[in-house]
């Protein structure tokens, strides 16, 4: 059995304040069954950045077409970046359950925010 891989190819991304940041994440398999979620930070205090089914995330949009079949690209775009958005972002695969159980995290992508050019 090939083990599911959660791939965040960029270790770091630098974006100018006011611009959009793209955080890339792909998975190697459609199974196990379960959702992908994005978080900033790790551990119990981490902040949920994007979850398709629950919550309202007006600045975050999926990069891939939401009607694309058998999607394995879970990259997101965050608009209007501010210095407060700096941090390490993790793409996390969950196994479906009651509740869903965290299965595997990507290695993380550190987002740094540059001052807006004058």
């Amino acid at each position: 059995e090939e083990e599911l891989q959660v791939i965040q190819p960029e270790k770091s991304v630098s974006v100018a304040a006011g611009d959009s940041a793209t955080l890339n994440c792909t998975v190697s398999s459609l199974i196990p069954v379960g959702p992908i979620q994005w978080f900033r930070g790790a551990g119990p205090g981490r902040e949920l950045i994007y979850n398709l089914k629950e919550g309202h995330f007006p600045r975050v949009t999926p990069v891939s077409d939401p009607t694309k079949r058998n999607n394995m690209d879970f990259s997101i775009r965050i608009s209007n970046i501010t210095p407060a958005d700096a941090g390490t972002y993790y793409c996390v695969k969950f196994r479906k359950g009651s509740p869903d159980v965290e299965l595997k995290s990507g290695a993380g992508t550190e987002l740094s925010v540059r001052a807006k050019p004058s």
């Epitope: 459609l30 069954v33 089914k53 009607t67 879970f74 196994r95 479906k96």
Partner: antibody
């Protein structure tokens, strides 16, 4: 071309057992979830079970009696049915799961079905 | 468990007519609805997913709409090969996946 071919159906007495198989071809079997859906004579569709990797899901009506499994080396899906009841009589379809976007699963390809009759 | 209610149970239609099927969910399922066609003695066939996306090879006379709890499948001009039973399915919250009871389309 995606193909799903079920086998193993037949007549069995109440309390008996049966093992269904579904041979898959035309897609990368090992990376997709696959499911069993049944249809009692003259009735509608009822989901039975789904398997991802080692993750399995069952309808309450079959939990504890049916076991879904897969052999990726043989591209084959199985359904072991024990303690069969008259109400399990149905055509059993094997179905390939498909996902859309970041969302849940539906069934984009179906086999032709195999009839299971539970009768004394 | 999310219950899907399809109406009407049976439709008697003449070829060339416009046909509309209804599927109502007992709670919000967003757009996570699929529609299937089943002809007698055959397996179901996927028509629509994500409420409104046509599957590959499905004629454009089939269209789906709706979100939340109310969904519609429309056949703009019924062809003779379209007779059969139509089922909706939700995949927003599972297990279990649930199907509607079906709408049978028969010749008037």
């Amino acid at each position: 071309e995606v193909q799903l071919v079920e086998s193993g159906g037949g007549v069995v007495q109440p309390g008996g057992s049966l093992r269904l198989s579904c041979a898959a071809s035309g897609f990368s079997f090992s990376i997709y979830a696959v499911s069993w859906v049944r249809q009692a004579p003259g009735k509608g569709l009822e989901w039975v079970s789904t398997i991802g990797a080692d993750d399995t899901y069952y309808a309450d009506s079959v939990k504890g009696r049916f076991t879904i499994s897969r052999d990726n080396s043989k591209n084959t899906l199985y359904l072991q049915m024990n303690s069969l009841r008259a109400e399990d009589t149905a055509v059993y379809y094997c179905a390939k799961d498909s996902t859309v976007g970041w969302s849940g699963d539906f069934f984009d390809y179906w086999g032709q079905g195999t009839l299971v009759t539970v009768s004394s | 468990e999310i219950v899907l209610t399809q109406s009407p149970a049976t439709l008697s239609v003449s070829p060339g007519e416009r046909v509309t099927f209804s599927c109502r969910a007992s709670q919000n399922v967003r757009s996570d609805i699929a529609w299937y066609q089943q002809k007698p003695g055959q397996a179901p066939r996927l028509l629509i997913y994500a409420a409104s996306s046509r599957d590959t090879g499905i004629p454009d006379r089939f269209s789906g709409s709706g979100s939340g709890t109310d969904f519609t499948l429309t056949i703009s001009s019924l062809q003779s090969e379209d007779f059969g039973v139509y089922y909706c399915q939700q995949y927003y919250d599972w297990p279990p996946f649930t199907f509607g009871g079906g709408t049978k389309v028969e010749i008037k």
